[in-house]
């Protein structure tokens, strides 16, 4: 059979080899399409409701005035020559429609690096047959599951015209120390071959380095956390990171009620003040990060001091923040 | 909303001629084929004429050929059916149809117009 | 020309009896048929488009159903509402030819 492609909504003339140019013609087409559930006949003399969608013209072809999804299918033409010599004809018809340019809509104009982010989503709609949808960086195609890349994809039909929406969305983990401005495009390949790719307008989103979190250092004087009764304790808690971030503080894995501060100061130290300490730096753009624990504890005179003392009471005591 | 409304029935002596109209809304006229259909006084329901979208392509049964002629104009959202040489037989209440092809059958219909033929 | 043999002609049935009325093709008309519903002085009305399938706003006790030529209108539990006469259509070749019709009578 030879192979037709025909446009959606666009006419189609089929030629019956052999037919005779002008009436009498003995001849006959018979269609297993879509509109059909065996074969249908379709005879130069027949006119009447199959018109609209196939007829045969006076020279012996069929005409479908606008091809439609329902028409892919066979169409086989018999026909007879003044000489009683007989000719088939045999076309195998497939349809397309080349969607609208497709589009990257819910664009991200921010990445962070390092960790997941959704570039986009990119739609193509009123396809057929279906067709794919890729992704490009900087022109190179995007393979989904690799260095970071995941795709979500979703295909719809229109339950009236039968013609495809598809969509496609972009995650990426954009390397540290990578290209700061990365361009993204989309482009729809149709499923039927010898028509080109539509792709859409690139995006460009910045990529934001963010600051490696160095550790939050716990501080404590004296080292070591021991300390006479009565004596003092100061905490310091030391975050590298810029702008300075909020430095909140913990006893024995509870926030203290005091305001935010990087020193804190335990004067007069006294049972109820053992315990173990961290900070909790918070940052805008990060979660919050803790500190390592350090443990205060009281020491008889006479006693040494150990490096790291024994929990003791749950009371505060007298708290001063620098 | 789809809308077909008839009109121009009557009484109408044997032999004599009828022009019927139908108006169409809510829809986009020259999209579709347009059937006429009758019904005689208590009895079934007989077609009596298709055209194409266009109106380039009319169809009827052996019972009206050469004596009634379907047309529309798109223009106008208008359906029409000429009725020459009108028998006692024609008498029937004709609705005008959205559709006759394969890809519609007869959807909507209007609510008909009487057509008497009698001396 | 097509001939569409509707049966039976008439029947007479109670509300939320299940009702069937069959058509029967004289040749293959594909799934090109319609089935309609007409009241006394009105326009008939579409039930079922291409043998199958329910026409918008048509209650869903309607349905139709084909085997090969012969083709069915089933109301699975007739209303007072449904009490009309019933015609199939096939709209496959000219002449579009309908049933004789069917007319459901109160028991």
């Known amino acids: 059979a030879q192979n037709i492609t025909a446009r959606i909504g666009e006419p189609l003339v089929l030629k019956c080899k052999g037919a005779p140019k002008k009436p009498p013609q003995r001849l006959e087409w018979k269609l297993n399409t879509g509109r059909t559930e065996a074969w249908k006949v379709l005879s130069p003399q027949g006119g009447g409701p199959w018109d609209s969608v196939a007829r045969v013209l006076p020279n012996g072809s069929l005409f479908l005035p606008a091809v439609g999804i329902q028409d892919e299918g066979i169409f086989r033409c018999q026909a007879m020559n003044r000489n009683g010599k007989e000719t088939k004809s045999n076309y195998r018809v497939r349809v397309y429609q080349i969607p609208g340019k497709p589009e990257i809509v819910d664009s991200a104009s921010e990445l962070t690096a390092g960790v997941p982010n959704k570039v986009g989503t990119c739609v193509s709609e009123g396809s057929y047959p279906a067709g794919t949808l890729s992704w490009h960086l900087d022109g190179k195609p995007l393979v989904p599951n690799e260095k970071g890349v995941s795709v979500k994809e979703q295909t719809r039909r229109h339950p009236e015209t039968g013609l495809f929406t598809l969509q496609s969305e972009l995650m990426v983990t954009p390397a540290r120390g990578g290209d700061p401005r990365p361009t993204f495009s989309c482009s729809f390949s149709p499923g039927l071959p010898r028509h080109r790719a539509l792709r859409t307008a690139p995006i460009q989103p910045r990529v934001w380095e963010p600051v490696p979190l160095e550790e939050v250092q716990l501080v404590v004087e004296p080292e070591g956390g021991a300390v006479a009764p009565g004596g003092t304790v100061t905490l310091t808690c030391e975050v590298p990171a810029q702008p300075s971030p909020q430095i909140h503080w913990m006893k024995d894995g509870v926030p203290l009620p005091l305001p935010p501060s990087p020193v804190l100061i335990l004067p007069e130290i006294g049972p109820q003040d053992q315990g173990t300490y961290s900070c909790v730096a918070t940052h805008s753009s990060h979660g919050p990060q803790e500190s390592r624990a350090v443990s205060i504890s009281i020491i008889e005179p006479g006693e040494e001091g150990p490096t790291a003392g024994s929990v003791g009471g749950s009371g505060l005591g007298t708290l001063a923040l620098a | 909303e789809v809308q077909l409304v008839e009109s121009g029935g009557g009484l109408v002596q044997p032999g004599g001629s009828l022009r019927l109209s139908c108006a169409a809304s809510?829809?986009?006229?020259?999209?579709?084929?347009m059937t006429w259909v009758r019904q005689a006084p208590g009895k079934g329901l007989e077609w009596v004429a298709s055209?194409?979208?266009?109106?380039?392509?009319?169809y009827y049964p052996d019972s009206v050929k050469d004596r009634f002629t379907i047309s529309r104009d798109n223009a106008k959202n208008s359906l029409y059916l000429q009725m020459n040489s009108l028998r006692a037989e024609d008498t029937a209440v004709y609705y005008c149809?959205?559709?006759?092809?394969?890809?519609?059958?007869?959807?909507?219909w209007g609510q008909g117009t009487l057509v008497t033929v009698s001396s | 020309d097509i001939q569409m043999t509707q049966s039976p002609s008439s029947l007479s049935a109670s509300v939320g009896d299940r009702v069937t009325i069959t058509c029967r093709a004289s040749?293959?008309?594909?799934?090109?048929v319609n089935w309609f519903q007409q009241k006394p002085g009105k326009a008939p009305r579409r039930l079922i488009y291409?043998?199958?399938n329910l026409a918008d706003g048509v209650p869903s006790r309607f349905s139709g159903s084909r085997s090969g030529t012969d083709f069915t209108l089933t109301i699975s539990s007739l209303q007072p509402e449904d009490f009309a006469t019933y015609y199939c259509?096939?709209?496959?070749?000219?002449?579009?030819?309908f049933g004789g019709g069917t007319k459901v009578e109160i028991k």
């Open positions: 809510g829809f986009t006229f020259n999209n579709y084929w």
């Open positions: 291409r043998a199958t």
């Open positions: 149809a959205r559709g006759g092809d394969i890809t519609t059958g007869l959807d909507y």
């Open positions: 040749q293959d008309v594909g799934f090109y």
């Open positions: 259509l096939e709209f496959d070749e000219h002449p579009l030819t």
């Open positions: 055209i194409d979208n266009s109106g380039d392509n009319t």
